[in-house]
Interface confidence: low
């Protein structure tokens, strides 16, 4: 299936040009999306091109500037947040990135009623997290690992926690491992729907081993960065959840929410918190051995001023074939009765589907079913449930939005997006206003992305929010590669692949092949999305064929494929890449003497193992910031898929699955190893150990480090990285510079 038909005709050929590496590094062909910042059922905020904050009312068609770019510029604000009562705006400046989601910033509060910044009782700096209450204009913020509350922006703060300490106790914000591997947020506090209560997590990292690495900077002596970072099998953070009444915070103070007994009996994690009403909250917990999850619904007891979590409101989710959930355990979406909920988990056939839970999980009513997967529940209203899935036309790498009418019986299902812009749009996400009165659809491809606004009742398109016209025009004279998404059937396994082909691709010719791999558990690389990136350039200008393959362990095709890698990472992911390469060679247009593989992070691990597989298939390959041993990576992630590195659990496979164990096999390939020295996520240690093993085995290899760069290798390092990798591949494939 050709997703991006080439626009090349002989008459046009002279005016058409190939992509250049400069195009990619300059972001010449990047696209825009439009996500409305919803503030009601029919209103949203958006930052205009000239940086004014504009309020749009869909029903009236009116728009007006609530905050001028002049005000934004006066404090160098890069972000903003309107209070729900619309009286104040916080302005965020001095953004300073910490980890993947976390950052610190300076906050100013602007009073819209008088057009002035709030003076007196200003906020301290830098703040780790700040947010408005869902109603009114109360503020909660985290400063120096402690939580503070303001009833109004100009009021003095009320200090909720006092035990916060850098790298020791975290209140209202996650520590490193919870941020990266469990919550995927910079915050760990949650307002109740009307702002009566504030729930927060406390993480105690006192006993966690610390990863230390040098940050070279410009000083005479490097700094040492210390992060409490639990690697596989190490001591984990201790988590507690508290709730405080924000109207009378000093009355009884923070009240701890009890942990379910079956969870508290051994090491455990807190995985998410969902408010149901102001006086009902739902917490999800997970055993350290992550195949048992407990959802606990707790109620506020007015008479005791405490939170009660009856056993009858505990719902257990267990996996017998793998770990609980997909990448994370799914979160519930509660219905209007405030006790029943909708949730995605595996059905009896091993496909993730939406279930309706009224009393017990055993009595759950299955809402969706089939040999495909429900991926996200966006919104439940009184009469509709909106979700995304990859059901349409049986392409796992697509995403369409569906509406199920739950107000009628039997419920009827409608695909909202399947036929909207069928060729252009096959991969959607959505953003809903209050009560799903309106929603925005954001289409990511395979054509040029487009964002549209829709009526939540009729699904009628109201207007185009962003259609990337400039991008479309800019691409008119570019020879883009062709892309196709197809599948291979091998030994009862379906391997979906995306192939990126040079613009004048000719099946009778031979082309060098580059495999791009990620391959991590519950990931998906073969997606019907638009991208003009490095591999587009390699196909367009350098005439390479690039292939991405989703093998065992990848997501959204059922538990059989997903859980195949359980407790044995580094085996089937690699096998499936190799199998696919053999199939590609059989297609007749691949030059089997010029095959390479590259990957980043988990993909660096897989590419390294593939190069060291001893098959002789690969001439060369690149590993960027690879994991080299699962003993070096984070506990929460690693143990989910591998269990514990102990003798009585899975130590043997931990040892067998390292890159270092295969050092000898790199002798007959050209290997480029790349890593940032300040990688907080996959520590430089991983590449240091590969390099050491290769040196000890007297195996030649190439390497590049990026000083003071983290896992993302951003800024000027990005340009250097892709230029360096391009030279390496062109040399490997004997392509002239």
């Amino acid at each position: 299936i050709v997703l991006r038909p080439s626009r090349v005709h002989n008459s046009e050929e002279n005016t058409m040009r190939a992509l250049t590496l400069k195009d990619i590094l300059n972001g010449t062909f990047s696209y825009k999306t439009f996500f409305p910042n919803w503030i009601s059922g029919q209103e949203y905020l958006h930052q205009s091109a000239d940086n004014n904050i504009v309020l749009y009312n869909i029903e009236t068609g009116q728009s007006y500037t609530i905050l001028s770019n002049r005000t934004m510029k006066s404090v160098n604000a890069s972000n903003y947040g309107l209070s729900p009562d619309r009286q104040f705006v916080y302005l965020e400046s001095d953004y300073s990135k910490l980890w993947r989601y976390s950052y610190t910033a300076t906050y100013y509060i602007y009073d819209l009623s008088n057009g002035e910044f709030v003076r007196g009782n200003e906020l301290p700096r830098p703040i780790q997290y700040l947010c408005w209450s869902p109603v009114g204009s109360k503020l909660a913020y985290v400063y120096q690992n402690n939580i503070y509350l303001k009833q109004r922006p100009g009021d003095p703060p009320f200090q909720i926690t006092f035990n916060g300490r850098e790298n020791k106790i975290f209140n209202g914000i996650p520590d490193w491992v919870y941020e990266e591997e469990m919550l995927a947020t910079k915050y760990a506090l949650w307002w109740s729907p009307n702002g009566k209560f504030l729930a927060y997590a406390e993480f105690n990292d006192t006993d966690i081993p610390v990863i230390a690495y040098s940050y070279y900077g410009d000083e005479q002596y490097p700094r040492t960065i210390n992060i409490p970072y639990p690697k596989a099998g190490a001591k984990n953070p201790v988590v507690r959840i508290f709730i405080i009444d924000t109207t009378y915070p000093a009355y009884v103070g923070p009240q701890e929410v009890p942990v379910p007994a079956m969870i508290a009996s051994s090491d455990y994690y807190f995985s998410w918190l969902t408010w149901v009403t102001d006086e009902r909250v739902c917490l999800q917990w997970l055993k350290r051995v992550q195949n048992v999850s407990v959802l606990s619904i707790c109620d506020f007891r007015e008479d005791w001023q405490t939170w009660d979590c009856p056993k009858t409101q505990e719902h257990i989710e267990e996996s017998r074939t793998g770990w609980a959930g997909g990448f994370f355990v799914s979160t519930p979406v509660f219905s209007y009765d405030a006790i029943s909920y909708y949730k995605i988990f595996s059905d009896k056939d091993g496909y993730k589907h939406i279930h309706y839970i009224k009393d017990t999980v055993e009595n759950a009513i299955q809402i969706t079913s089939g040999k495909w997967e429900a991926i996200n529940i966006f919104r439940v209203t009184q009469d509709s449930l909106f979700y995304s899935s990859n059901e349409f036309e049986e392409y796992p790498g697509r995403r369409n939005i569906y509406r199920i009418s739950i107000g009628s019986y039997p419920p009827s299902k409608k695909c909202v997006t399947c036929h909207l812009r069928k060729e252009r749009c096959q991969y959607y996400t959505a953003s809903f206003s209050d009560y799903a009165k309106y929603y925005a659809l954001v289409c990511y491809g395979p054509g040029i992305p487009i964002s549209t606004l829709h009526d939540g009742r009729t699904d009628q398109e109201i207007k185009i929010l962003e259609e990337n016209k400039e991008l479309e025009n800019a691409l008119k004279n570019i020879q883009l590669p062709k892309e196709e998404i197809k599948k291979l059937e091998v030994d009862e396994i379906t391997l979906w692949y995306k192939m990126i082909l040079p613009p004048q691709f000719d099946r009778s010719k031979k082309y060098p092949l580059l495999i791009q791999v990620y391959g991590g558990p519950c990931s998906q690389s073969v997606r019907s999305v638009f991208a003009v990136n490095w591999i587009s350039y390699l196909a367009s200008k350098e005439g390479m064929v690039i292939a991405l393959v989703d093998g065992r362990g990848t997501a959204f095709q059922g538990d059989k494929l997903l859980y195949a890698v359980y407790r044995k990472l580094g085996v089937y992911e690699v096998e499936d890449q190799i199998t696919a390469v053999r199939k590609f060679i059989e297609m007749g247009f691949i030059d089997e003497k010029r095959i390479a593989i590259w990957g980043w992070s988990y993909g660096g691990y897989v590419s390294s193992l593939a190069l060291a597989s001893g098959t002789g298939l690969f001439k060369c390959g690149i590993a960027v910031a690879p994991v080299s041993s699962w003993e070096y990576y984070a506990s929460v992630y690693t143990e989910r898929f591998m269990g514990l590195p102990t003798k009585d659990d899975n130590l043997e496979h931990y040892k067998n699955s390292t890159v270092m164990a295969r050092a000898e096999y790199f002798r007959n390939v050209d290997y480029l190893l790349i890593h940032g020295t300040a990688d907080d996520n996959v520590h430089f240690q991983n590449s240091a150990q590969i390099a050491k093993a290769l040196v000890n085995a007297q195996v030649d290899f190439q390497a590049m480090w990026y000083s003071d760069q983290n896992h993302g290798l951003s800024g000027l390092s990005t340009n250097h990285l892709y230029t360096h990798m391009t030279h390496f591949l062109k040399q490997c494939f004997s392509l002239s510079d």
Partner: antibody, heavy 120, light 111 residues
Framework: QVQLVQSGAEVKKPGASVKVSCKAS????????IHWVRQAPGQGLEWMGW????????KYAQKLQGRVTMTTDTSTSTAYMELRSLRSDDTAVYYC?????????????WGQGTLVTVSS | EIVLTQSPGTLSLSPGERATLSCRAS??????????MHWYQQKPGQAPRLLIY???NLESGIPDRFSGSGSGTDFTLTISRLEPEDFAVYYC?????????FGQGTKLEIK
């Protein structure tokens, strides 16, 4: 300055239709909603509906749904209100009004009104 | 729909006096941010004229003897010192919900 100028008075027979125009000037026509409000002789004001010339968004009062059509011509900055199947109780002064620049539903500028008389 | 009830129906006062006109809504027309109530003046043979928007904001060009107050369901238009040109019919209007509705009017006449 902002002005809304309406078409002249009309006399119609029951069952007929009437189309009243409202020409806007002094502001960007596509930015503000135009409301239509009527007032029967000696009576109060009754909101009939709105049209937003920029987005084409239209809202009609339930009572008039099916009989009223509101349109705009952005090239001439003119709004139109057509009322069909006229009855004697449709006799009224018909006003167009601009949705205020502050938004939120106040009508800051009004046309001079068009008297529509329905009589056999 | 939201019904607006104005009182009194007719108010007889002399120039120089203070006028207080009332408007009660059948349900709240306020949110935490705004009260969606507006006031208009209409003289015989003329179109209505906006005086007050969002309960208490004076429209530009309107004399400051006019003021508005209230929230929720009860609203007041006050004219601090009546001038001869103030004698007219006054209407309140809500825009909290569709359909927009007007009160039946209060006639302010010279005593």
């Amino acid at each position: 300055q902002v002005q809304l100028v309406q078409s002249g008075a009309e006399v119609k027979k029951p069952g007929a239709s009437v189309k009243v125009s409202c020409k806007a000037s002094g502001y960007t026509f596509t930015e503000n909603i135009i409301h239509w409000v009527r007032q029967a002789p000696g009576q109060g004001l009754e909101w009939m509906g709105w049209i937003h010339p920029g987005s084409g968004s239209i809202k009609y009062a339930q009572k008039l749904q099916g009989r009223v059509t509101m349109t705009t011509d952005t090239s001439t900055s003119t709004a139109y209100m057509e009322l069909r199947s006229l009855r004697s109780d449709d006799t009224a002064v018909y006003y167009c009004a601009r949705h205020g620049a502050t938004g939120r539903g106040a009508m800051d500028y009004w046309g001079q009104g068009t008297l529509v008389t329905v009589s056999s | 729909e939201i019904v607006l009830t104005q009182s009194p129906g007719t108010l007889s006062l002399s120039p120089g006096e203070r006028a207080t006109l009332s408007c009660r809504a059948s349900q709240s027309v306020s949110t935490s941010a705004y009260s969606y109530m507006h006031w208009y003046q209409q003289k015989p043979g003329q179109a209505p004229r906006l005086l007050i928007y969002l309960a208490s904001n004076l429209e530009s060009g309107i004399p400051d003897r006019f003021s508005g107050s209230g929230s929720g369901t009860d609203f007041t238009l006050t004219i601090s010192r009546l001038e001869p040109e103030d004698f007219a019919v006054y209407y309140c209007q809500q825009s909290r919900e569709l359909p927009y509705t007007f009160g039946q009017g209060t006639k302010l006449e010279i005593k």
